[in-house]
């Protein structure tokens, strides 16, 4: 399903695809990251990908299509 990025960038991994385990990278405390659909105002936020809303932080994140990366999936992976 591609890469997941979010802004503002923070440490920790996010789910790249539904069903993946969304856990932080801090060894002492694993915290699941919860998502919902991005509000309509972010309809075109992810250039080449799908927008998901990080519930706890109230920020958008992007699941990039294969071959793209960047906070908004705006960059082309030349090595793909």
């Amino acid at each position: 399903d591609g890469n997941t990025t979010r802004t503002p960038e923070t440490n920790g991994s996010l789910c790249g695809a539904p069903g993946e385990n969304c856990t932080g990278t801090t060894p002492r405390q694993k915290v699941k990251t919860h998502f919902s659909r991005c509000p309509k105002q972010y309809k075109h936020y992810c250039i080449h990908g799908r927008c998901r809303f990080v519930v706890d932080e109230q920020t958008p994140s992007c699941i990039c299509e294969k071959g793209y990366f960047g906070a908004r999936c705006e960059r082309v992976d030349l090595f793909y």
Epitope: A17, P18, G19, E20, K32, H34, F35, S36, R37, K40
Partner: antibody, heavy 119, light 107 residues
Framework: QVQLLESGGGLVQPGGSLRLSCAAS????????MSWVRQAPGKGLEWVSG???????TYTDSVKGRFTISRDNSKNTLYLQMNSLRAEDTAVYYC?????????????WGQGTLVTVSS | SYELTQPLSVSVALGQTARITCSGD??????VHWYQQKPGQAPVLVIY???DRPSGIPERFSGSNSGNTATLTISRAQAGDEADYYC?????????FGGGTKLTVLG
């Protein structure tokens, strides 16, 4: 084909408990958020609770602290544990699949199971 | 909490156009979805994301959403369209349904 089948409904006294089940088939159950929606006799649809594919839960105010939504991905089954039931919980309870994450729409519905709370 | 308001009933003559409204504060800034429910049956999604149609739903069904009103339009109404219709939106991590509109097809 994609299917949801609810069970566990029935007659229960006020203050009693009931556990509803929703068996999913025809799709990768673990990849989807799921919800329960109810409909009182002759009334409209009311969303009850939702459960994300990574365990995030959310409830309508009237059932918070009384109902618990859960899932068993190994059994492709969604549950709704209902405690401290009230007469106003009487309804047909539908299991519904959220398209992708929370906040999309319900693209697949079960046929519903009737819960009657009465003495 | 967010509220969606629908007319209790709408009537339309066979073959004519029915319009069912769904009102909410700045609803145009939200995605709106529509469900059809016939007696004794589960709801069926007929319009999603304001105006998109799921596969299998006739082109006669269309939707729009702007300002404070979303609208479901059913062109060339047929007897089989007689049902209850519900709008739905998402607000503050919860699902909100409209109260429902009973569509009656006359003639």
């Amino acid at each position: 084909q994609v299917q949801l089948l609810e069970s566990g409904g029935g007659l229960v006294q006020p203050g009693g408990s009931l556990r509803l089940s929703c068996a999913a088939s025809g799709f990768t159950f673990s990849s989807y958020a799921m919800s329960w929606v109810r409909q009182a006799p002759g009334k409209g649809l009311e969303w009850v609770s939702g459960l994300g594919h990574v365990g995030y839960t959310t409830y309508t105010d009237s059932v918070k602290g009384r109902f618990t939504i859960s899932r068993d991905n190994s059994k492709n089954t969604l549950y709704l544990q209902m405690n401290s039931l009230r007469a106003e919980d009487t309804a047909v309870y539908y299991c519904a699949r959220d398209y992708l994450d929370f906040g999309y729409y319900f693209d697949v519905w079960g046929q519903g199971t009737l819960v009657t709370v009465s003495s | 909490s967010y509220e969606l308001t629908q007319p209790l009933s709408v009537s339309v003559a066979l073959g004519q156009t029915a319009r069912i409204t769904c009102s909410g504060d700045k609803i145009g800034k939200k995605y709106v979805h529509w469900y059809q429910q016939k007696p004794g049956q589960a709801p069926v999604l007929v319009i999603y994301d304001d105006s998109d149609r799921p596969s299998g739903i006739p082109e006669r069904f269309s939707g729009s959403n702007s300002g404070n009103t979303a609208t479901l339009t059913i062109s060339r109404a047929q007897a089989g369209d007689e049902a209850d219709y519900y709008c739905q939106a998402w607000d503050m991590q919860s699902v909100v349904f409209g109260g429902g509109t009973k569509l009656t097809v006359l003639g």
